[in-house]
Each structure stands twice: as C-alpha cells, then as structure tokens.
Interface confidence: medium
C-alpha cells in the first residue's frame, strides 16, 4: 500500500476565478504537486470556508505575504 495511506492529502483541481479580499482571509496552506494534480494554495476564510487558488497569480502571492506578516509576533 502507498505510504501514509491513512492520511489522505487534500487536493485542488480548479482555482477560484475571483480575487478574495485579504480582510476575508484567516490562513493558508500550500499543496505540493508531488501528491496532487496541481500545485495550489488553499486559503481558509474567516468563516472557515476553504478555497483553492493559483500560487502563480500575484494576488495569491500578495495575500500569502500579508498573512505571513500578520502571523509574525510583533517585536517589543
């Protein structure tokens, strides 16, 4: 049997067609191509909805940067 068979990997087959406002985004995770059909970013919104997005699009990259900065602990 394949390794990690009891831990199925979530995949993206299609990407959202519309840009999502960063104010609606809570977090993200990357999906790698070795386990799924496409490399993808899965955004989780503030209402816990998950949406697949294209990591090559600038708005997706900008949104990830924004979320990264949000999660960094503030320097005192």
């Amino acid at each position: 049997q394949p390794d990690a068979i009891n831990a199925p990997v979530t995949c993206c087959y299609n990407f959202t067609n519309r840009k999502i406002s960063v104010q609606r985004l809570a977090s993200y995770r990357r999906i790698t191509s070795s386990k799924c059909p496409k490399e993808a970013v899965i955004f989780k919104t503030i209402v816990a909805k998950e949406i697949c997005a294209d990591p090559k699009q600038k708005w997706v990259q900008d949104s990830m940067d924004h979320l990264d900065k949000q999660t960094q602990t503030p320097k005192t």
């Epitope: 199925p8 990997v9 979530t10 995949c11 993206c12 087959y13 299609n14 990407f15 959202t16 067609n17 999906i31 059909p37 993808a40 899965i42 909805k49 998950e50 949406i51 697949c52 997005a53």
Partner: nanobody, 125 residues
C-alpha cells in the same frame, strides 16, 4: 465503502505500451476524481494522472504528459491508464485511488482516501 481493483500490469520492454484498468464499485462515483499514483521501491508515492468522473477533465504529472492517457467508461465504472513509450523509470507499483470532490469546483477535495491494492509495472531495458 468504495472498492477499487486494478489490473493490466506486467513486464514490458522499454518503448512498449500497457493499459491499466481500475474497476470501481460500492457507491456512486459522479462526484469523484479517479487518480493513478505510482510508488517505486524506496521512493515516495507519486501522482501520475487523474480524471473527473463527472466532466472528464484530465490532469497529468509533467513526467508522463504526452505518453500516458487517462480515460473513463462510466457505464462500466472503470478508469483506464494507457501508458505509451514506457521506460525503466516508469517501473513501479501503480495504484488507483478515488478522491471525493467538493460541490464548489474551487473548493479543495477531501483527499484520496480510497485505494486499490496496486498492480506491478516493470519496464526492462
């Protein structure tokens, strides 16, 4: 519960072809993607190809594009993987898997959580 049974593996010379079949049973597959993965000894499982059961959209790993073709026969609940121009690097156990898709096309799937037992493909040089 979903059952997946692969067949069609075997030994083939480099440059040859094989067609793998995956017969699915146990429930309705209208909202599934059916995928083929492979695992060579000592290596990680690797995505090969997938097809959406509902609309027939296909997806391929870069390493097999132009050589492998995935297709489906809805009437037989069977998915096929036609493998042409095989080379020794394609040697692996090939697994069929089912991935439950979300209603929203842009939502992530649940993940490949149903698997067949695998069929061995050996390509000799």
């Amino acid at each position: 519960e979903v059952q997946l049974v692969e067949s069609g593996g075997g030994l083939v010379q480099a440059g040859g072809s094989l067609r793998l079949s995956c017969a699915a049973s146990g429930r309705t597959f209208s909202n599934y993607a059916m995928g083929w993965f492979r695992q060579a000894p000592g290596k990680e499982r690797e995505f090969v190809a997938a097809i959406s059961w509902s609309d027939g959209s296909t997806y391929y790993a870069d390493s097999v594009k132009g050589r492998f073709t995935i297709s489906r026969d809805n009437a037989k609940n069977t998915v096929y993987l036609l493998m042409n121009s095989l080379n020794p690097e394609d040697t692996a156990v090939y697994y069929c898997a089912a991935d439950l898709l979300a209603e929203d096309p842009a939502a992530p799937s649940r993940g490949y959580d149903y698997w067949g037992q695998g069929t061995q493909v050996t390509v000799s040089s």
